[in-house]
Every structure is written in C-alpha cells, then in structure tokens.
Interface confidence: low
Amino acid sequence: DYKDDDDKLSTSKTIDMELVKRKRIEAIRGQILSKLRLASPPSQGEVPPGPLPEAVLALYNSTRDRVAGESAEPEPEPEADYYAKEVTRVLMVETHNEIYDKFKQSTHSIYMFFNTSELREAVPEPVLLSRAELRLLRLKLKVEQHVELYQKYSNNSWRYLSNRLLAPSDSPEWLSFDVTGVVRQWLSRGGEIEGFRLSAHCSCDSRDNTLQVDINGFTTGRRGDLATIHGMNRPFLLLMATPLERAQHLQSSRHRR
Amino acid sequence: DYKDDDDKLSTSKTIDMELVKRKRIEAIRGQILSKLRLASPPSQGEVPPGPLPEAVLALYNSTRDRVAGESAEPEPEPEADYYAKEVTRVLMVETHNEIYDKFKQSTHSIYMFFNTSELREAVPEPVLLSRAELRLLRLKLKVEQHVELYQKYSNNSWRYLSNRLLAPSDSPEWLSFDVTGVVRQWLSRGGEIEGFRLSAHCSCDSRDNTLQVDINGFTTGRRGDLATIHGMNRPFLLLMATPLERAQHLQSSRHRR
Amino acid sequence: ALDTNYCFSSTEKNCCVRQLYIDFRKDLGWKWIHEPKGYHANFCLGPCPYIWSLDTQYSKVLALYNQHNPGASAAPCCVPQALEPLPIVYYVGRKPKVEQLSNMIVRSCKCS
Amino acid sequence: ALDTNYCFSSTEKNCCVRQLYIDFRKDLGWKWIHEPKGYHANFCLGPCPYIWSLDTQYSKVLALYNQHNPGASAAPCCVPQALEPLPIVYYVGRKPKVEQLSNMIVRSCKCS
C-alpha cells in the first residue's frame, strides 16, 4: 500500500486562492526587479515632470504591438533571455543620402540603408544584441505579392535573407523581418553604412517582376524615385539588447546554477 | 506569519527517487496505451513469426531519424496531437510516367509527382492528416545552393511553398520539407496526380539559375534526363495521421474536460 | 487548451489559467513604472487529478491521461504553457528607458 | 539549461532531468512493442526552492528568480521543458503498424 508515498507526491491539496494570488504578486515584485537586475526600485528623484516624450511612447508602442511576420516569443528561453532587454530604434538613413543614388532605377526593388554608428551607439557589442527586427509600414496593396528581403553583402552583391507572401489589404500594416544575425554581423564589422533590399520574388520563368507593394517612406509611382519620407514611420530597426552594465553579471554565469 | 501557508505550497520536500521512478514507469504504461487508445495491450496471437518486414523497418527508421529542415516537435501540442499518429509513406510516381514528359527540359528544376489514390489509401480524410513531409535524399553538393519548393497549382502555374539554403557537403543527406497544408488540399480535391517542383532560387537580376544539387532518384548530368530511380530512396511523402477508427473518439471531445 | 478563452468563462476546478491583474501602484506600491500602469499577469492553479495504482485496471485511468497527465509524470503539476512578454517604460535618473521583460503574461496552462 | 548534458554529469539536488531507461519487456512486462526494445524516457525531479516573504528585503532573493522561479509562480514546480517523440512498431492482428507517440522523451526540465 503506497498511501503515504502518494501523499508525498500529491498536488491536488486544497489551496487558498487568496494566498496564491498574494504569493504570485510578491513573486512578480521580485521577478521584475530581478529581470532588471535591480536590488530595489530605482529612485524617482531626478525624473522630469510632465508626460513621457513622444519618441519614448512611440518606441513603447512599437514594442507592445505584435506585427505581421513577428513570431510570438519562443519558449523555452536561454538563460540570458531571462533578463530584461532594452529597446531602441534606429531609423533608416534618409533617402537624399548619396548611398541611394546608384540604386535608383530598379522597378523590382527598394533599398534601405542604416548608419552603423547609430547602431553601435544603441548596442555597443554584438553579443549584447538579443533581437533585431526590420519594421516596414506597408501601405494598401491591391494584389497578392511575394517579396524577398536581401542584405547588402559586398560591393554589388546581395545575400537572400527571407521572404513573405503579402495578402491584399485596404489598410496600412506594419511588417516585421527578423534580422538579428545580420545586425550582429554589422556590429562586428567596420562598415559605416549597411543596407537591405526588398524585392519582388522572381521565379525562373516569370518575367513580371515589379514590386507592387508600397512601403511608407518611399513615394509611390516609380519605385526608383526615393524622394519623400513620411516622418517617423519610415523603415526602422527595432533593437532589443542587454544593457552593457547588466551584461557584466552574465559573463561567467553560463549555467543557471 | 504565513509559515503554515508556506508549507501548503512547498515543493522542496524530500522525495524518494525509487518511488518516483516506479510512478513514472507506471504512468508511462498508461500513457502509451492511452495514446494508442487501447484499453489493454494488443493480442499477439496472429503476429507472423520472423523479423519485421524490410519496408516496415525502413519506415520506422525514416520516422526515427531527424533530418535537415525538420523542426523538433513543437511544444505545446493541440489536444488531438496527444494521440499516436500512424506513419506511412508514399513514394514518388516513377519517372517513366507520362506526366513527367512535358517537364523534361528544364535546367533549373526537377519535378516530383504523387498518386493521390495512394495518398487517400493512407489518409482517408484530410482532417486526419497531422503532418506531411516531403523527403528528398540529396547527394553530394560542391557549391552552396539556394533552392525553392513549389506546388503544382493549375494547368501550368506553380505556387511557391518554401526555400532552403543548402550548404556544400561530401555525403548524402536527407532533406525534409513540411508540406502538410498542400497534402491536405490534395486529399480534399479530385485530382489523380499532384506534384512539386524543386528549383534553383532565381533572383531578379541573376541569370545563373542552374539547379546544381543532385537529388537521389534523378540521374545526374542533364537535369532533364529523369530516367533511373535508385530503389526505395527516391523522393517520398512521409505521412503522419490519426487512424480512422481512432478518430471517431475524438469527434465530440472538443475540450479536455 | 486551458487558455483565457476557456478558463475565464468557466468554473473549472482543475488546472486552469486564473485571472490576475496587477496594478503597479496599488498592488506593489510602485510609482516608478511609467507605462503600463498595470498588466494581466494571470497564474495557473488547480489540481491535475491523476489516479496512480499498481493494479492492472488501466482502462480506468486511460481517459485521464490526456486531461490530467499527458506527460506521464509521477506527480503532474499545473504550470504555464503559453507566455507573453511585457514592455515597460521607467526612468534611470533623468533618462527614460523602454525594456522588454520576457515571459510575464500567462496565456494558458497545462498539466505537466 | 537543465538538460541531459548538465544533469546527467552533475550531482544537482535541485530540479533537473533524471535518467530513466524503460525496457518494455523488463519494466512493463510487454512483448507487443517490436521496435524499439526500450527508450530513454527520463523524468524531472528536484525542488525549485524559492523563499517567499512579506518583508522588504527583496535584494536577498533577487538572484534566485532566474534559477528557481523564473516564471514568478506562487509555488514553482520542476517540469519538462524539451520533449521528443518516440516512434514504435507493433502489430494489430497480422498487420504491422508504425506509430509516432508525441512528447515521450524528456530532454530537459525547468522550474515553472
């Protein structure tokens, strides 16, 4: 008779719901501080009065909103991912920059370049980067379009990264591409400006290779005419990274115990 | 003081390892029978003497071996996926079939057709299909190659499904593509023969579109000469499905309680 | 699944996700998190009743595995299945920071 | 991770994956599964020690969350994290069947 043994392992004891709620709340108090690596809540003495800056709210909203193509957070998470990630964003270099000149005439592609010094300011070391997403605001689209994303590789070569099938839509929608590996590479290299290309998917026999989709930040009509930029909603890189000061704790703690 | 309450929720009691092992073993006894929807172990009275048939062992090995491109089983699983899935395989239609004639001359693609009557024999209803993988034995490859998989859609059109970057390799390697949705479509439709196309990835500006990779089942050299088939290792569909008799239990039990 | 859709609308006594909204100011006495003001943390609670016996009448317990002990554990436990992250805004000195905290919101539970 | 690489080579007393090989014939008395003859089922065992208190000395317990209560549960529990399927061959009458059983092999555990 294993009666006593069974009791040892039983999980179906009556548990007071209020006690559990209280314990959960207290556990969350510790969890949040722990994820931020804070021993106690930060002092609010120097916090400027008034509402949060617009740019901060925009960044917060970008992080909060799940967008097309972004996968739900994977579970399980590596140990380093337990800790909070600082979120920053780096906007695409404006299109009057000379880098765009030699890419103007293509009907099947648009180009997006980023200043690596801005990236390095946000993420000082490649190893700190936990996730990088390229976010594009896609405007209305009349027909289904299959697009591909490429990374600028060497002088005139492009490396395929991923693809997406875009359904027709009457309303604007944010698209997200995971470009963590690419941005990590950029942070490791010495280049000043790095870029992506969004192209129509070209099959080996098809000849209709026009990029139909409109991305905010590039004027519609000829794909080559990269003139007007629509404010903050031009393409950007959303970066999630471990802050440098927090990373030092993680260095040698490769295992959880 | 919540001392007693704490004890209620404590998980750090000393537990006898042997008892836990015994409980785990007994739980697995029930789990296996439950997953197979068997009330008791099946009778062995009619089992033929001698070793298992070659084809059964080959199928078992195909299932056991994790192959390139196949993701580890996702967790969480939907309720229906708790139950065991019967595994079958359907080989590609041999290449002397007339269906291949009109696709012979391409250097950028190979074609693989399947008999839907064989698929229906293995999986009588689309809803029973839990997973379908297209498995290809890729032979040695000298250079990196980016390939794309398409589904035959209508008379002469092909629908893009997925892509894969194949690294150079001196040894043969099985590739796996998840084609569950496509096979489910085929089972719902009336067609007799359905197919896939494996093509070199063609970018909008590149003109070098030759498929370099050799897939077992198609002779090397000219991609167009689809003559010799190398035994059981030609492309096949690996199907995992709920057996019809087991599915009836699942019909009305939409929720676990 | 034992998710918010099912559990919040039922009186399920066994393992299920339970509603818990945390207001940073009221529940934790914190004013330092500027956004959001609180969040639906939720939690998992409820037994995973599972009959274990050395006798051979397995048919009795077979139906229970899928519900209460799908992983054939020696002592199944009600734990989170699907989790979601939470972004927050707070200040370090005069500098506002946006940070993402992983696995903060429980969307569904399972007996494991 | 609390996986087979770490747990099988350590004397970890806390939550970890533990070795368990099941021989269908010896352990279950079954001759009806023709392939495999047995498998490494493994299991999760060990406490997820976690100090909960109403006092305000949080700094003491902060370091513990990642190890023992990453999900901020009221009562963390040692459960499977990564699972793998098991294919089997058995006969129904004269007909051999290959079936895949999901989530049969425990590869790693976590406090959840």
Epitope: H249, L250, Q251, S252, S253, R254, H255, R256, R257 | S12 | - | Y6, S9, S10, T11, K13, N14, P47, P49, Y50, I51, K60, V61, A63, L64, Q67, H68
Partner: antibody, heavy 122, light 108 residues
C-alpha cells in the same frame, strides 16, 4: 567523484603575501558558488568569504581589507589572495563548495577540501 | 554582526546516550542555520541545514530543530563514530555567515 584540493600553503613571513589555490574536479565548477574558510590550530572555524558563479564576492568584515577571492572557470580553480599577513592568520585554509538547494544556502558548505596549512612566522 | 554562541563548549557522554547541543544567534536568522561535524585531521562534514533538514547520507539519529535565535542539535543514541567536534553556522545572508565556537563531544 567531487574533489577539492587546496595548495599554496607553507611558511611565510609577517607582512608578506600568499596566494592559495583550490583545484576542483568531479563537478561543473563554473556553475557552483565557492567559499573559503579557515581554522586556526586548536580553534574553531572562521568564514572568510564566498564567490558566486559570476564572480560576485562576499567577504567577512575582518577579511575585506587584506583578502581577495577570485576564480578562473576555464581552469576549474578558486583562488584566495592574502596580503599583509600576520601571525594570527596562521591556520588551515579550506575551500568548500556552496550549496544551493534553498535560496541563501550558497553559504552552506556542502563539500570541503582537505585544507592547506599556512604558517605566518618570522 | 551576528554572533553564534554554542553550549556547552565540551561534554562527556557514553555510547547510547542522548546528546543535545544548543546554539544561540544574537539576532533572528529564521531557519538559516546548519550543523557540521569535524573529526581530528579531517575537514568538517555537513549534517543538517535549514535548521532541521538532514543532509543525505547522514544517519537518522542526528536531528535539528529551532528557528529565530535558538537552535538544537540532538544525537538520539550516541555511537562510537560520533565522538567529534560539532559546529553550528548561520547563513541568512553574506554578511552573517558565522560559525559557533564548537562543542567537543568526548568519551566518558
């Protein structure tokens, strides 16, 4: 099996420095908290300090000025650097693996080395 | 600083005797208390942690109790191999890791 072997002890003159090492084997060293404890001849145990996996250290108040604890996870070795030694530092020095079955029990000495004798004498 | 005061500092007992050693902390340490046994020429060995939890492999004749400031180690029936020095230890945090001065258990 688990082994901790201290070395580097011996006779040293007052005011000089000494570095003790503790070589660990039989367990995943980089995942474990480690402690140094000493025992003067014929006396009781004195906790010197502890180092967590990440390199964070705690030391007894009396040890803070002169004693430094460090570790090299790649070499599976724990170190104790002792400066400005005095006669009262004469003791057997033990390294011990901290235990972590409950929260604060990094400071429960779960497994001890055999110790190395340090004699401070002119 | 926390102080751990052990008593008695030594005791004589016979095989089969019940032996009790006490330890008092200068301030509350909850149940963050451990007991060690040390034999001559050997390092200490952990017997009990969390005031009352027996370390695996330690005979059940050893038991611990107490919380807050007062703790007790009991050997229910002294065996020949139990003659040794016993130390209590506090460990509520990194600033309060302290050992008692020890209790020597000798043969009567």
């Amino acid at each position: 099996q688990v082994q901790l072997v201290e070395s580097g002890g011996g006779v040293v003159q007052p005011g000089r420095s000494l570095r003790l090492s503790c070589a660990a084997s039989g367990f995943h060293f980089s995942n474990e908290a480690m402690n140094w404890i000493r025992q003067p001849p014929g006396k009781g145990l004195e906790w010197i300090g502890y180092i967590y996996t990440s390199g964070t250290t705690y030391r007894s108040n009396w040890a803070r000025g002169r004693f430094t604890i460090s570790r090299d996870n790649s070499k599976n070795t724990l170190y104790l650097q002792m400066n400005s030694l005095r006669a009262e530092d004469t003791a057997v020095y033990y390294c011990a693996r901290g235990w972590h079955i409950f929260g604060h029990q990094y400071w429960v000495m779960h497994f001890w080395g055999q110790g190395t004798l340090v004699t401070v004498s002119s | 600083d926390i102080q751990m005061t052990q008593s008695p500092s030594s005791l004589s007992a016979s095989v089969g005797d019940r032996v009790t050693i006490t330890c008092q902390a200068s301030q509350s340490i909850s149940t963050y208390e451990a007991w060690y046994q040390q034999k001559p020429g050997q390092p200490p060995k952990l017997l009990i942690y969390a005031a009352s939890t027996l370390e695996s492999g330690v005979p059940s004749r050893f038991s611990g109790s107490g919380s807050g400031t007062d703790f007790t180690l009991t050997i229910s029936s002294l065996q020949p191999e139990d003659f040794a020095t016993y130390y209590c230890q506090s460990y509520s945090d990194g600033d309060s890791v302290k050992f008692g001065q020890g209790t020597k258990v000798e043969i009567k």
